[in-house]
């Protein structure tokens, strides 16, 4: 009967592809009259079609080169694999999709480069003291974590311009302290001072030789100096088989793109390297500070991780940077920066905890979509990243290529890669929207009314001005009795009213809205629903009369995602558990369960057994999550320390268990009207007496 | 059409490098990863390996590791392959070629530079 | 590296004839298997990617068939301008490679 490849009208094989990936083409020159070339391939067989003449491309996936992936990071660096396989070959067919996977392993013993880049302004001074001997307190750490540890140092300030510097009076151009009755360095924009070393004293000493500037204003340029710090890695000595971390320590703001104009600095930051032999940055007065967009793209390119310590008055504000910087983690430095240590190591187990998958150089005709297979093998549709594991862990990620219509380029390639790893999936993209049998065409061929077109595919394509299967009818011999094969039934209108019929073929109008198509001009790409004003939500193509949905898009408007990232709570699941992920928005389902990803529940039976852990974590210091370093992300909740329990009403749920040393603990969960949730904890846990 | 224009011959003495490059017209350069093939008489063909000029993303034949460098400038739609440290096993026609990702065909080459190192 | 063998190192055959040159692989290549021609000039073309499917623009009496190990090119009606060397290559598995040519003469 009639499907999708039998009532498109089209003419030729590669028109014939292009309708669905269900249609095949025969171009068998002996298939029976008035039997559809562009049908699907079990009836073009049913026709007689001989199979070698039926063109039918399927698409398909290929791995070309799959190393395994690595146990230890130690060895031969350039042997370790974290990420297989590492490259494949798609075929893809116009409008089809390929599936193809990729594993993650987070290896053990991995070596790892430590960059800290330090304001040293000078507001910085008590914490350029506690740091001096951090190299090798950071060594004795990191020793648990891996065997090959480098660390290097660079400071910054600003840009030694007004109105950034002192520059009145004349001494406080040499000395920017002097009218503080003390002495203080010169200021200077970014200088790296110690290339990545295993020799982790050389970190103290050169620390110990360091002073602090002063700039003039509040922001400071860190950003200059983390993008230097970045892009000059052979000054840093940053390592291609390494993990990078770049720390960054202020306790100011920073100064970003278009503050430079401030100074009449005008041109761009050009994301290059100008450290010269000095060490000191050499376009600091001439190039603007860096975009967060550039910053972004030069640490990616550098797979580094960036670690903002910074001070509480300015931690919300490196929070928003953080979350448009993929793979970038934030501390808060104490006052004199004596919980740096910690802090890094925190941030690193946060770094080693997460993988999360980036995509590079896209084709805008192609769309991913993900399904993240992390722990407990369960497939979490949608989500492009895996948190909560351990070094050593393996998480696969299943993805799906779809290619919009037939791109212009037939090559393309892409790079999938988890963020901050030098280890990476190419992806090489052939797009199959031709056949084969086109290599054989016969220009100007006799079986075309003697030369009025190619035989190609077992049909003629007719020169200008011809028409007809056999290219017999001149455009300009119009005869009305043809008339009845340009509509679909006796009545209907001829060629949909969109068209003129000639020599009983349908020459479809040209419209300033789109194309229209067909064998009875009765398709277009214009008339799809529109929803909020744009065609397919602006999430697919219309495609006569129906919306083709983008990936990660679904639905009759196409304006539902299929994307569940926005339904991950921070324990890790889906609607916290209670829910389903609908459109990319939690329906909560379990009684009584509220908020964005239905986390919050007072009265649900597990509130006291996961409300626990955060007691333990963030009263006690100790427990599950404790161990893991995890606490504040999974605990965001206030706790409050109490003599005894008041009756805080129905929202309020009170809680008992046994603790490691057999004492009974009791709190109350709570949350308040503005959503904020509070844990009361009884100050003093119950114990046993012991024996009199 | 598509063409790849290849520099013209070199004679060059041991120990030196040269640098041989591989014009693309015809195709969007940038898309297609280019391959370097070396030809011995009597050795055959040797894939040395392939750049994708849209990002720089370079792979090497292990045998010509740290003898081949592979550049790319977009903007002249220009292909470089570098041959460092040459001897007379160096000696060689070298060509560029466009490919086929997915049949890992090459579909157009270039005509060949050959290379000379003699003292 | 998968090995790739032109036993027949050269070939003797008269216009008109029909010309077969094989290739062997030392392992299973699934079918992605490459023929090219290099002229005497040196200039070198794609004649038929994928075991069987033809380039554009190269002429029909070029065929090619095979599967798993064993591949082979035909050249139904061999022409004074088909004079060449024919190599073939794998694309199964990185690196490709080779086979050492096959020099088609004319008797």
């Known amino acids: 009967g009639p499907n999708i490849c039998t009532t498109r009208g089209v003419s030729s094989c590669q028109q014939c592809l292009a309708v669905s990936p269900m249609c095949a083409w025969c171009s068998d020159e002996a298939l029976p009259l008035g039997s559809p070339r562009c049908d699907l391939k079990e009836n073009l067989l049913k026709d007689n079609c001989a199979p070698e003449s039926i063109e039918f491309p399927v698409s398909e996936a290929r791995v070309l080169e799959d190393r395994p992936l690595s146990d230890k990071g130690s060895g031969d660096s350039s042997q370790v694999t974290q990420v297989s396989p590492q490259r494949i070959a798609l075929r893809l067919r116009p409008d089809d999709s390929k599936n193809f996977s990729i594993q993650v392993r987070q290896v053990e013993d991995y070596p790892v480069d430590i960059y800290y880049l330090m304001d040293l302004s000078y507001s910085m001074k008590d914490d350029l003291w506690s740091i001096q001997n951090l190299g090798t307190k950071l060594a004795t750490q990191m020793r648990k974590l891996t065997s090959n540890l480098r660390i290097g140092f660079g400071a910054f300030v600003d840009k030694p311009v007004s109105p950034y510097m002192y520059i009145s009076p004349p001494e406080a151009l040499e000395n920017p302290c002097y009218d503080m009755k003390t002495t203080c360095l010169p200021m200077f924009g970014y200088k790296h001072v110690l290339t990545l070393t295993d020799q982790v004293t050389r970190f103290n000493e050169e620390v110990k030789k360091q002073s602090v500037s002063r700039n003039r204003d509040a922001p400071e340029g860190g950003f200059d100096a983390i993008m230097q710090a970045t892009v000059c890695d052979e000054k840093i000595g940053w390592r291609n088989d390494a993990s990078h971390l770049l720390v960054f320590t202020t306790d100011a703001k920073t100064h970003i793109a278009l503050d430079g104009r401030l100074a009449g600095i005008v041109q761009p930051n050009d994301g290059q390297c100008h450290v010269g032999s000095d060490n000191h940055y050499s376009a600091s007065t001439t190039m603007d500070y860096p975009s967060l967009g550039l910053m972004t793209e030069k640490l990616s390119q550098k797979n580094i991780n960036l670690i903002f310590a910074v001070t509480e008055n300015v931690v919300n504000l490196y929070q928003n940077y953080s979350e448009l910087i993929p793979g970038t983690t934030v501390g808060v430095l104490s006052m004199d920066s004596s919980n740096v240590l910690q802090l890094i190591v925190d941030a690193y187990g946060k770094i080693r905890s997460k993988v999360e998958l980036e995509v590079r150089d896209l084709p805008e005709e192609l769309s991913l979509s993900f399904n993240a297979t992390c722990l407990n093998n369960e497939v979490i549709p949608g989500l492009k990243s895996c948190m909560g594991l351990k070094i050593g862990d393996t998480v696969s990620f299943s993805i799906e290529a779809k290619v919009r219509g037939c791109p212009q380029e037939k090559e393309k390639s892409f790079t999938i890669k988890p963020v901050g790893f030098k280890d990476s999936l190419i992806v090489q993209v052939t797009f199959d929207c031709d056949c084969a049998c086109q290599a054989q065409a016969e220009p100007n061929s006799h079986r075309c009314n003697n030369g009025n077109g190619t035989f190609e595919c077992g049909v003629c394509r007719c020169g200008p001005g011809w028409l007809g299967s056999q290219c017999e009818c001149s455009e300009e011999d119009y005869r009305p009795s043809q008339q009845d094969e340009c509509s679909p039934r006796e009545g209907q209108p001829v060629c949909s009213q969109r068209g003129e019929c000639l020599c009983g073929q349908c020459v479809c109008h040209s419209s300033d809205f789109g194309k229209i198509t067909g064998k009875y001009c009765e398709c277009d790409d214009f008339s799809c629903v529109r929803y909020k004003g744009e065609m397919c939500s602006g999430h697919g193509q219309c495609s006569c009369g129906d919306c083709l949905c983008d990936s990660d898009w679904t639905g009759y408007y196409c304006n539902c995602t299929t994307r569940t990232d926005t339904c991950m709570s921070s324990n890790g699941l889906l609607c916290s558990g209670r829910g389903k992920c609908e459109c990319g928005s939690c329906v909560c389902i379990q009684p009584g369960s509220y908020g964005d990803t239905c986390e919050k529940c007072p009265t649900c039976p597990d509130a006291c057994t996961f409300k626990k852990e955060c007691v333990e974590c963030k009263k006690f210091d100790r427990g599950a999550l404790h161990d893991e370093n995890t606490c504040n992300r999974y605990c965001r909740d206030e706790i409050e320390s109490v003599k005894e329990l008041k009756d805080t009403g129905k929202d309020a749920v009170n809680c008992t268990y046994k603790n490691e040393d057999d004492c009974v603990v009791r709190f109350q969960y709570y949350e308040d009207s503005s959503g904020k949730s509070i844990l009361y904890v009884v100050e003093e846990p119950e114990c046993p007496k012991g024996p009199d | 059409q598509v063409q790849l224009q290849q520099s013209g011959a070199e004679l060059t003495k041991p120990g030196a490098s040269v640098k041989i490059s591989c014009k693309a017209t015809?195709?969007?350069?940038?898309?297609?990863?280019i391959e370097w093939v070396k030809q011995r008489p009597g050795h055959g063909l040797e894939w040395i390996g392939e750049?994708?000029?849209?990002?720089?993303?370079?792979k090497y034949n292990d045998k010509f590791k740290g003898k081949a460098t592979f550049t790319a400038d977009t903007s002249s739609n220009t292909a470089y392959m570098q041959l460092s440290s040459l001897t007379s096993e160096d000696s060689a026609v070298y060509s560029c070629?466009?490919?086929?990702?997915?049949?890992?065909?090459?579909?157009?080459w270039g005509q060949g530079t050959s290379v000379t190192v003699s003292s | 590296d998968i090995q790739m063998t032109q036993t027949t190192s050269s070939l003797s055959a008269s216009l008109g004839d029909r010309v077969t040159i094989s290739c062997r692989a030392s392992?299973?290549?699934?079918?992605?298997l490459n023929w090219y021609q290099q002229k005497p000039d040196g200039t070198v073309k794609l004649l038929i990617y994928?075991?069987?499917r033809l380039h554009s623009g190269v002429p029909s009496r070029f065929s090619g068939s095979g599967s798993g190990t064993d591949y082979s090119l035909t050249i139904s009606n061999l022409e004074q301008e088909d004079i060449a060397t024919y190599f073939c290559?794998?694309?199964?598995?990185?690196?490709?490679?080779f086979g050492g040519g096959t020099k088609l003469e004319i008797k």
């Open positions: 015809g195709y969007t350069f940038s898309s297609y990863w």
């Open positions: 070629a466009r490919l086929i990702s997915y049949y890992y065909a090459m579909d157009y």
């Open positions: 994928y075991t069987s």
């Open positions: 290559q794998q694309g199964n598995t990185l690196p490709p490679t």
């Open positions: 750049i994708l000029p849209g990002s720089g993303i370079t």
């Open positions: 392992q299973d290549i699934s079918n992605y």
